[in-house]
């Protein structure tokens, strides 16, 4: 399956925080989305192979890495002034 953690996270002002996303499905592609109240999902970053990733529609204030196939952590940087949202990770073949 695919596992995202933590379920809830509080960020102190000026801090970077990292959300974990791990999958054991042997999927090449992984995605991070953000959902704000009353809105649809918006793509932050996506990755289609190891060590390669592209910006989505709202990448500013976020960073990612894809060091291995199974993992695609998202860092919410201190530059992201409005981080409060629901974050969703997904994967596909």
């Amino acid at each position: 399956g695919i596992t995202q953690s933590p379920k809830y996270l509080f960020r102190k002002e000026g801090q970077n925080v990292t959300l974990s996303c791990e999958q054991n499905l042997n999927h090449d592609a992984m995605y991070w989305y953000r959902q704000d109240p009353g809105q649809g999902l918006r793509l932050i970053y996506y990755s289609q192979i190891v060590n390669d990733f592209q910006k989505g529609d709202i990448a500013e204030g976020y960073s990612v890495s894809r060091e291995k196939k199974e993992s695609f952590p998202l860092t919410v940087t201190s530059a992201q002034k409005n981080p409060t949202a629901f974050y969703l990770c997904a994967s596909s073949i």
Epitope: Q48, I49, N51, S65
Partner: antibody
Framework: QVQLQESGPGLVKPSETLSLTCTVS?????????WNWIRQFPGKGLEWMGY???????NYNPSLKSRITISRDTSKNQFSLKLSSVTAADTAVYYC?????????????WGQGTTVTVSS | DIQMTQSPSSLSASVGDRVTITCRSS???????????LHWYQQKPGKAPKLLIY???NRFSGVPSRFSGSGSGTDFTLTISSLQPEDFATYYC?????????FGQGTKLEIK
Amino acid sequence: QVQLQESGPGLVKPSETLSLTCTVSGYSITSGYFWNWIRQFPGKGLEWMGYISYDGSNNYNPSLKSRITISRDTSKNQFSLKLSSVTAADTAVYYCASPSPGTGYAVDYWGQGTTVTVSS
Amino acid sequence: DIQMTQSPSSLSASVGDRVTITCRSSQSLVHSNRNTYLHWYQQKPGKAPKLLIYKVSNRFSGVPSRFSGSGSGTDFTLTISSLQPEDFATYYCSQSTHVPFTFGQGTKLEIK
């Protein structure tokens, strides 16, 4: 900052096995990425030989497949190249290398290179 | 294997010149994920190659803006807009879309 350093004999006899080791510092080879061997012939041509992945899986250049083995020693954070049945055509500068984060497979961490001469 | 053919093999130019090096692949370098893994390296004597451009047109960290890459499919170009003394070196294109990864034969850029 990832750093790589090759070590091994500079002279190998024809028909013997070439053995080189790459010691990696600044990053664990099991944490991610692909750990490559690339060689450069005296005429300056570059050839990708193969890699060992963070999970221990291999990908080799088919032109070398019957002769090449890339393995690793995770306790020493090293990966190694063995090339059997060498001839003078295997004389080259041998580099270990790994990709830079976020560049696909584009390599930008290189060892300093070690010159291997095949001669009796 | 994908053959990578660079032209010219050598080139003489002066400081301040605009220089273009071309690289042609024997097959399309568009990956099934729609990215194109074509890269450019610079090598100076006795040193390992250095990454300049990755994925056709992305300048690597610390690479001056006078270096640019373009192209698609099978035809690619490295352009140096205004040559500086430190740019005289050998340049290689490389593809990592298809295994085995392959390199061009190199273009030696010399001072006129």
